[in-house]
Structures are given as structure tokens and as C-alpha cells.
Interface confidence: low
């Protein structure tokens, strides 16, 4: 059993290492602010792949079973409060990056086999949004994202599992905001 776990872990570490590099690349890029419409876009084809769509939803469901705290919502109307439609993709980019860095990577050994497939997929989406910026002040967006981060941090591991349980909503929200 230990050997099996080790082989799964080593396979996963390779996958996650690639994902981490992708993420580091996008974090380093930064770049000057560009008009919203030019880079805050994802191709519709990213959300039209039955296999990875299903794996993302299965991962969310698996995580749902591991947490009984059904009263707290992370991705909901409050997240988008005061954020215009044209800024929502940028907002979701922030949520996606936080979810990858602070939730999925630390929990990478759980919820197999879905995690090892979904994390690289989400990391690719994150990479494609690396040049997505908005012109002007984004404080209102950062404030909303910070509330989500604070909620996850306050709940500890339970918050991380809750975030994984909401990957279905993250997927749908990214689709709605970014295509």
C-alpha cells in the first residue's frame, strides 16, 4: 500500500511540478495593464471537452462528501458584488490562481484520480489568463477576492476542501466570465 501511495505521489509530483512551473511563469510575467477585451478571454473549446469537464465535476463531488459545513458559500453573488461584467474574467482569474496555489497544490495528494487530471487543466487555464489585466483601480475586485481568501483561511483545511467542493462553480463561472 505504501509503495502504491509512493508511486501515485511521485507521478502526481511530476504533474504538479509542471503545473507549479506554469503558475510561476504567469506570476512572474505580470506585464503592463492591457485593455480588458484583449487578454481576458478563454477560448470556448476549453470548456467543451467532455472528459475534463466531467472529471472537474467529479472532483467537486468527491470533496463535497468530505465536508459537512454547508452553510458557507465561497463562489456566489457576494463574490461578484460591485464588479462589472467586463471585469468578471479578471476576478475569476484571481480566484483561480488562489485556488491553485493555496488550495489544490496543498491538497494535491487527495481525491485521486481526479486531482492529478484537473490540476494541470486548471493550471493551463490560469496560464492562458496570465496577461489578463484591467485598466485602472482593481481595489473593489481585490476586496471581494480577499473576503473569499479570508473565509478559506479561517476555516483551515475545511475551507480548502470547501473550495475544492466548489470547483464546479469555479469552472462554470470562468466559462461565463471569460468566453
Amino acid at each position: 500500500m505504501a509503495a502504491l501511495q509512493k508511486s501515485v505521489s511521485s507521478f502526481l509530483m511530476g504533474t504538479l511540478a509542471t503545473s507549479c512551473l506554469l503558475l510561476l511563469a504567469l506570476l512572474v510575467q505580470g506585464g503592463a495593464a492591457a485593455p480588458i477585451s484583449s487578454h481576458c478571454r478563454l477560448d470556448k473549446s476549453n470548456f467543451q471537452q467532455p472528459y475534463i469537464t466531467n472529471r472537474t465535476f467529479m472532483l467537486a463531488k468527491e470533496a463535497s462528501l468530505a465536508d459537512n459545513n454547508t452553510d458557507v458559500r465561497l463562489i456566489g453573488e457576494k463574490l461578484f458584488h460591485g464588479v462589472s461584467m467586463s471585469e468578471r474574467c479578471y476576478l475569476m482569474k484571481q480566484v483561480l490562481n488562489f485556488t491553485l496555489e493555496e488550495v489544490l497544490f496543498p491538497q494535491s495528494d487527495r481525491f485521486q484520480p481526479y486531482m492529478q487530471e484537473v490540476v494541470p487543466f486548471l493550471a493551463r487555464l490560469s496560464n492562458r489568463l496570465s496577461t489578463c489585466h484591467i485598466e485602472g483601480d482593481d481595489l473593489h475586485i481585490q476586496r471581494n477576492v480577499q473576503k473569499l481568501k479570508d473565509t478559506v483561511k479561517k476555516l483551515g483545511e475545511s475551507g480548502e476542501i470547501k473550495a475544492i467542493g466548489e470547483l464546479d462553480l469555479l469552472f462554470m463561472s470562468l466559462r461565463n466570465a471569460c468566453i
Epitope: 470548456f47 467532455p50 466531467n54 467537486a60 463531488k61 463562489i75 470547501k162 467542493g165 466548489e166 462553480l169
Partner: antibody, heavy 121, light 111 residues
Framework: QVQLVQSGAEVKKPGASVKVSCKAS????????MHWVRQAPGQGLEWVGW????????FYAQKFQGRVTMTRDTSINTAYMELSRLGSDDTAVYYC??????????????WGRGTMVTISS | QAVLTQPSSVSGAPGQRVTISCTGS?????????VHWYQQLPGTAPKLLIY???NRPSGVPDRFSGSKSGTSASLAITGLQAEDEADYYC???????????FGTGTQLTVL
Amino acid sequence: QVQLVQSGAEVKKPGASVKVSCKASGYTFTHYYMHWVRQAPGQGLEWVGWINPYTGGAFYAQKFQGRVTMTRDTSINTAYMELSRLGSDDTAVYYCAREPEKFDSPNAEIWGRGTMVTISS
Amino acid sequence: QAVLTQPSSVSGAPGQRVTISCTGSSSNIGAGYGVHWYQQLPGTAPKLLIYGNSNRPSGVPDRFSGSKSGTSASLAITGLQAEDEADYYCQSYDSSLSGYVFGTGTQLTVL
């Protein structure tokens, strides 16, 4: 056994809102997505949206976005669908339907009996 | 409204075989999403008949079978019986709409 029991028939005036409930029993409510589907008299089935009872997160068909709200109360294993700004073309039977646990093949496995909503001035 | 197209009606004599087609597009059936079939008897809620293209839930007779090819699917009913008279709907997931879609519905008449 698994059952979905829906609230009774409603008659509403144009412009009003209606809230239909769906009480689940015989299974763990938070483990399964719940869908809402409607059927106008003599017409086909139309998907309204789904709610994830675990998170409370909902996703709606584009046609209904801005007009529909799906919620749930996990303490009483009940899902709700509220439709606002009702018009005569919203007259229909509204069904709740539970999806199987595996999302590989999303479909409506268990159905409620439906709630007839009539819009009449 | 409906994204999946079905014939409005089909009919057959008892004991015969009938098929109901369901035509979609590259964003639903053709994209690889499963096709599911429902039977709706008059005045009742729909009942799941076939899921994931060709699987039967327990309790559904093996007279009912489903298949899928390309952007289309079909439901076959063999040994037609009077109690099979109902409306039949296909359903899938559509990635361009990011939602579930139903067929237009087919009324089956047993002659």
C-alpha cells in the same frame, strides 16, 4: 425509498413571483445535484437549472438567468426554485429531478411529481 | 427552444419494432456527451429509460435499447406493447450553452 415530494399547485398574477419546494428523502441530500425542469401544457421538457445542495451553488439555463433563484435548506433536505416576473408563458408543470451520484453520465434519475404553476390575471 | 430534434410522432402495431431518432450537433451529442432517454406516460412525471447512450436502469425491460453514432442517437423498442404508448424525450449536455438540453419529444402510438 428515494422520494422527491413537491409543493402544491400555485396560481399567480403576471409580474408576481412563485417559489416551489422539493423535499428529498431516502438518501443523503447533499450528495446529489438537483435539477429543475419545466413543461408547459402540451409542450416538451425544458431545463431550468441545477443546484448543488452541498455548496448551495446554482447554475441556470441562459433563458432564465436573472429571473430564477435556486436555494436549499439542508436542515430539512429541501430544494427551492423561485421564478420572478412571471408571464403567461411561464404557466407550466415544474419538476425537480435528482441526478445520479456519478457525473460521468448526467441525467435526471429520480423525479418529483411536479408542481403546476398557472399565471392568470 | 429544444436543441435536439426528434420526429413528432411514430407509430407501430403490437409486437412490432419502432425506432425514435434524436439529432444533435457537435456541441452536444457529437462532442461526446451522453444521451439519455425518458418515457412520459400521460399525466405523469418523466421516467428515466436509458442513460449514457445505451444503459438501462434496473426495472426497465430489455425491449428498450439505445445507441449513438456521431451527432445522433436513437431509441429502439421491440415487441411493442399497448403500455408503451407515451411521449419519449432524449436529453444531453450542451457545452456551448453550458446546460442540459432536451429533444423536441416524440409521441408513440401503438396501433
